[in-house]
């Protein structure tokens, strides 16, 4: 194996770095961009989709969770399969699963089917990161591997920018919708979901023009196929550099003898499904065996260390980046509540209300023979009030409640004042006629504040760019470990600044700082993961670690967001501790700079 690694490195040096790698860079970049988009889709559509699908808080939470769950399963599944079936083939299948279900999710109406489609879409895209980095690394010579893998990371950021820009451009346009009958509605947020499937679709199209990794062929004893691909790399680069006359000098390459080739069954043995069943079981066994070998004596220490680093990095990064917008919303809510107007003991008779009431509390009021027509109630509370001989028509409300109120001889026509909005209230001889249909839940809706999140995400993802460039340029100069540990320490320090963020703009600025600093850790971690494992375990290990990363993300998000409105100290302390632990673990890993790809 060592001999193969050395020879392969020499061949890649002969092939050079040129047009072939840059073409592959953009193709795989699209696949990585699709992953960057996926993380944001659900978060961006929730403010609009919650009304359409009538989502409760638990439904919304489940929708956010399901994407990570899908990506977790996908990373492990496709990562394991890519070491057995090939990088290109598995990436094509996983992206196809992603784009098909992302496409379907744009059209399905029910919450359950939307959830299912997003789950499978997540399973599909889960294969992107583990396969893309392994695949690209196998076309890169040692000299610039770290730098070019880091440039590839930039596409994840581009995916986030694309998602935020598209959300900003599409979702607020309610006009971009149509209705078929009374049941089928296609609103602008669905157009956004559809547009978010484009990177994946384009990646599939572009990937069909690319060859399989020659290193995978060699690991599986396919010498001729590997030679053909390497010749293609050489010839493409030489033609582009203006040396078409240069001949690919390699004639023979070492190959690994395959011991556990897929079991082949005679076609006359049993039914087709039995044959496929045996093949699937055999393949599953090999994938599982390969995964367990990552915990074998040779790799156990590395795997456990990497698990620690991936977990702590993900826990703090995802925890904080989801906690930020929640914290901003909390600050907005606190500010909004501070501006609430209170009207005590008012007595109103024979008055017609036909305007908007917002952010008010009416206490101990008496309303006689009043008409509330075409009224918009936004964050209004009526407490201990009496409504007698009143008439409500065409009233729409959000975050509005009637607490301990009494209604006598009152008529409600075409309102959305559903039962739960009357808390400990008495209705005497009162009638509800033609209540508004649709979602009976109070949804936060799609006000300016809801769209603000697109802009914040846009800024936050864009802020990663300087960190990405710096880390790419320094990756091969200072080494992966210094980059990882240094960036983690800087992230840890930037975490403490969060304590001083008491305004919306300060929090956004700190989000950008944290994202910009921590990206270098992610880049270093991706490069390290690729280089620490041999080619026959590379995507399996990467897939497993990426699955663990998604689990850590879910835990981080759950724990951090539970402190919103309670304390800022706990999430900052958790994140700092995790980052400190991660950087100390990272320093115990072996440096891979200057090594040939095993």
């Amino acid at each position: 194996r060592e001999e193969l690694a050395q020879q392969y490195e020499a061949i890649l040096r002969e092939c050079g770095h040129g047009r072939f790698q840059w073409t592959l860079y953009f193709v795989l970049g699209l696949a990585l961009m699709a992953d960057g988009v996926e993380v944001f889709v659900v978060g961006f559509v929730l403010p609009s989709a919650e009304k359409d699908m009538c989502l409760s808080d638990s439904n919304k939470g489940m929708l956010g969770l399901i994407v990570y769950l899908g990506m977790m399963v996908g990373a492990f599944l496709w990562g394991g399969l890519a070491d057995r079936l090939g990088r290109r083939q598995c990436l094509l299948i996983s992206l196809s699963v992603n784009s098909v279900f992302a496409f379907f999710s744009s059209f399905v109406q029910g919450y359950g089917t939307f959830l299912f489609c997003r789950l499978l879409s997540g399973v599909g895209i889960g294969g992107s990161i583990p396969i893309v980095f392994s695949y690209f690394s196998e076309f890169l010579a040692q000299e610039k591997r770290g730098e070019h893998l880091s440039w590839l990371c930039m596409f994840w950021m581009i995916g986030g920018v694309y998602a935020a820009a598209m959300a900003w451009a599409i979702i607020p346009h309610y006009g971009w919708s149509f209705q078929m009958g009374s049941a089928y509605q296609f609103h602008s947020w669905r157009v956004f979901v559809l547009v978010c499937a484009f990177p994946s679709v384009f990646a599939i199209g572009a990937l069909t023009t690319q060859p399989e990794s020659p290193r995978f062929f060699l690991e599986n004893g396919k010498h001729d196929e590997a030679w053909m691909v390497l010749k293609q790399v050489h010839d493409t680069n030489m033609r582009a550099k203006g040396h078409p006359e240069r001949v690919f000098s390699v004639t023979h390459i070492k190959t690994i003898h395959q011991e556990d080739e897929l079991i082949e069954i005679q076609s006359d043995t049993g039914a087709w499904y039995q044959r496929w069943g045996v093949r699937a079981l055999s393949l599953g066994g090999q994938v599982w065996g390969n995964f367990l070998s990552c915990f074998g004596p040779e790799y156990r220490r590395i795997t456990l260390m990497m698990m620690g680093v991936w977990f702590t990095m993900s826990f703090s990064y995802y925890g904080l980046t989801v906690w930020f917008p929640d914290m901003i919303r909390h600050l907005q809510a606190v500010d909004y509540a501070a501006r609430t107007k209170v009207f005590p003991g008012e007595r109103v008779e024979h008055v017609t209300f036909n305007f908007t009431l917002e952010n008010q509390i009416h206490r101990g009021g008496q309303y006689f023979n009043d008409k509330f027509i075409g009224l918009r109630l936004k964050s209004v509370s009526f407490e201990d009030s009496l409504f007698e001989e009143c008439y409500f028509e065409d009233v729409t409300s959000s975050n509005t409640f009637f607490r301990n109120c009494t209604f006598i001889n009152t008529v409600f026509y075409n309102t959305d004042l559903f039962e739960y909005k009357f808390v400990n209230s008495r209705l005497v001889n009162s009638t509800f006629l033609h209540n508004k249909e649709g979602c009976p839940l109070d949804v936060t809706g799609t006000g300016e504040g809801a769209y603000m999140v697109y802009f914040v995400s846009f800024l936050g993802t864009l802020a990663v760019l300087p960190g990405n460039i710096v880390s790419a340029l320094l990756m091969d100069k200072i080494g992966r470990l210094r980059m990882l540990a240094g960036s983690s320490v800087m992230s840890c320090v930037s975490c403490f600044f969060l304590s001083f963020g008491n305004s919306e703009s300060a929090m956004i600025a700190l989000l950008c700082l944290f994202g910009g600093v921590s990206i270098a850790s992610w880049n270093a971690l991706d490069v390290l993961t690729v280089e620490l494992y041999p080619s026959d375990k590379r995507t399996t290990a990467f897939g497993f670690l990426n699955a663990l990363c998604k689990l850590a993300a879910v835990l981080g998000i759950s724990i951090f967001t539970s402190f919103v409105g309670i304390t800022k100290a706990a999430p900052i302390l958790f994140a700092s501790a995790a980052l400190a632990l991660g950087s100390s673990l990272a320093l115990k890993l072996p440096e891979t700079r200057g090594q040939v790809l095993q």
Partner: nanobody
């Protein structure tokens, strides 16, 4: 006191049409809303369609595109044109009205008219 009288119910084949009418009489002050509810055997009364002053209409999702409500404010009458009828439209249809009197809103109901669409 206001009286509401419905007419036009009957038996109609699936896919057929029917027109229900309702006339209000008595001391009407300001007839703000007129509309229709229906009640199938063993079911709760459900909203069908209504029309408020200013020709603002509301329809239940189940009848949108098939039923049309119209109103003559001068005569205080309301009509419901029902097309593409289905067996699930079988019910007693009740006319209702909301009169905004000097003393507050008053809701009035008709006796109901039977509509049957055999399966």
């Amino acid at each position: 006191q206001v009286q509401l009288v419905e007419s036009g119910g009957g038996l109609v084949q699936p896919g057929g049409s029917l027109r229900l009418s309702c006339a209000a009489s008595g001391s009407i002050f300001n007839m703000r809303v007129m509309g229709w509810y229906r009640q199938a055997p063993g079911e709760q009364r459900e909203s069908v369609a209504s029309m408020a002053s200013g020709d603002k209409t509301t329809y239940a999702d189940s009848v949108k595109g098939r039923f049309t409500i119209s109103r003559d404010n001068a005569k205080n009458t309301v009509a419901l044109q029902m097309n593409s009828l289905k067996p699930e439209d079988t019910a007693v249809y009740y006319c209702h009205a909301v009169d905004l009197t000097r003393n507050g809103p008053r809701v009035y109901w008709g006796q109901g008219t039977q509509v049957t669409v055999p399966p």
